[in-house]
Amino acid sequence: GITIPRNPGCPNSEDKNFPRTVMVNLNIHNRNTNTNPKRSSDYYNRSTSPWNLHRNEDPERYPSVIWEAKCRHLGCINADGNVDYHMNSVPIQQEILVLRREPPHCPNSFRLEKILVSVGCTCVTPIVHHVA
Amino acid sequence: GITIPRNPGCPNSEDKNFPRTVMVNLNIHNRNTNTNPKRSSDYYNRSTSPWNLHRNEDPERYPSVIWEAKCRHLGCINADGNVDYHMNSVPIQQEILVLRREPPHCPNSFRLEKILVSVGCTCVTPIVHHVA
């Protein structure tokens, strides 16, 4: 394996809970700048499995506002603009990492938390269960 | 806005960069359990806008390996199983938080970073530009 030497300038942790509790710089670096000039925010309307976005707010969490996708229909929109129930609109779900204040209401102490969010919807062929 | 009083049991931060640098408990709590009984991981194959997963690795980041969705086709799969180029397969993107070692190779000091990942694809009606 690749062996990377420890940086001699690393901060020491005197915390008795180390390594469970570490220092994290919250000056969030955004690597997304200009990565995708074609990124579109209107797919939720143009998709054959369109979705609505619902606001979920929690002041004890970072990010405090998360927008969740909810598929508009059980089926998918066909070429005529009608809902085709032979196909299914399903949410694409993704686990994301958030920070939760712990203990609650503390401005400088957090815990990492994994939550499941629906990002958008896609149209899939249904799984048909044949009854014997 | 709602004013939440500061918890008197909060840890103090002596760090000169406070509140940019905070204490984070790395014992990741999973809030997903039992939230979604219908969660499926095979949509990437069953979608009318199917996708493949491509590996991106960075040992200084957690998670170090990120599999990104890349749509298989420009068009979408129709009822006959053929690609219909009158529709477009497009990636659904999501901003996620990752942790980066900072300074590099330090085991107990991190920085939060936001990156944009493609988590799946959806089928959309194309935007048609009419030439005058």
Epitope: - | T33, P63, S64
Partner: antibody, heavy 126, light 107 residues
Framework: EVQLVQSGAEVKKPGSSVKVSCKAS????????ISWVRQAPGQGLEWVGG????????DYAQKFQGRVTITADESTTTAYMELSGLTSDDTAVYYC???????????????????WGQGTTVTVSS | EIVLTQSPDFRSVTPKEKVTITCRAS??????LHWYQQKPDQSPKLLIK???HSISGVPSRFSGSGSGTDFTLTINGLEAEDAGTYYC?????????FGQGTKVDIK
């Protein structure tokens, strides 16, 4: 190619401790976790605990809490499992396994054990 | 903790036969269920991850299905080399747990 090579068999007295090592090669050590799984003679598999090498943070099964310590040394790409207060019930083959922790298909960090060490037999006998 | 119950405990089969092993979780685990094969005196080997995803190098006769609480491992056309014990494993929540195992031998 990923390889996990474990230390040799150990014979220990009741009440003593054992420390088993798992040397990883192939790929970046901090890109995945290492879990420890044991198998008593003629029995099934039992998860002991695991470590996220990127953070150096370990999680343990409640059953072993307080007498197991899992650590990782990045400089030698080696993980260790130390079990104390040994009894005859701890006689087993101890395996290390790679825990991928990959952002994949809706999961922030996957936890299937894709590569395994060859196993270390620990015998506890007076 | 999440309990995984496999059935059957033991199966004796003839080559080319189809083998089905089930694994039931005591609570919903989504798709976080994996299958391993262990041959005598060998380490376990990952066969299927996340309920239905095949692993590179594993023969295509091995397949998995299910989600929530009920999962199935299928061996389509068993071969002599498939003799061994099969385990399911959940990674939805700590502590990770395994099924008790299903031993498959060849008649």
């Amino acid at each position: 190619e990923v390889q996990l090579v474990q230390s040799g068999a150990e014979v220990k007295k009741p009440g003593s401790s054992v420390k088993v090592s798992c040397k990883a090669s192939g790929g970046s050590f901090t890109s995945y976790g290492i879990s420890w799984v044991r198998q008593a003679p003629g029995q099934g598999l039992e998860w002991v605990g695991g470590i996220t090498t990127f953070f150096g943070v370990a999680d343990y099964a409640q059953k072993f809490q307080g007498r197991v310590t899992i650590t990782a040394d990045e400089s030698t790409t080696t993980a260790y499992m130390e079990l104390s207060g040994l009894t005859s019930d701890d006689t087993a083959v101890y395996y290390c396994a790679r825990d991928p922790h990959e952002f994949w298909n809706g999961y922030y960090a996957t936890h299937d054990f894709d590569y395994w060490g060859q196993g270390t037999t620990v015998t506890v006998s007076s | 903790e999440i309990v995984l119950t496999q059935s059957p405990d033991f199966r004796s089969v003839t080559p080319k036969e189809k083998v089905t092993i089930t694994c039931r979780a005591s609570q919903n685990i989504g798709s976080a269920l994996h299958w391993y094969q262990q041959k005598p005196d060998q380490s376990p080997k990952l066969l299927i991850k996340y309920a239905s995803h095949s692993i590179s190098g594993v023969p295509s006769r091995f397949s998995g299905s299910g989600s929530g609480t009920d999962f199935t491992l299928t061996i389509n056309g068993l071969e002599a080399e498939d003799a061994g014990t099969y385990y399911c494993h959940q990674s939805d929540d700590l502590p990770y747990t395994f099924g008790q195992g299903t031993k498959v031998d060849i008649k």
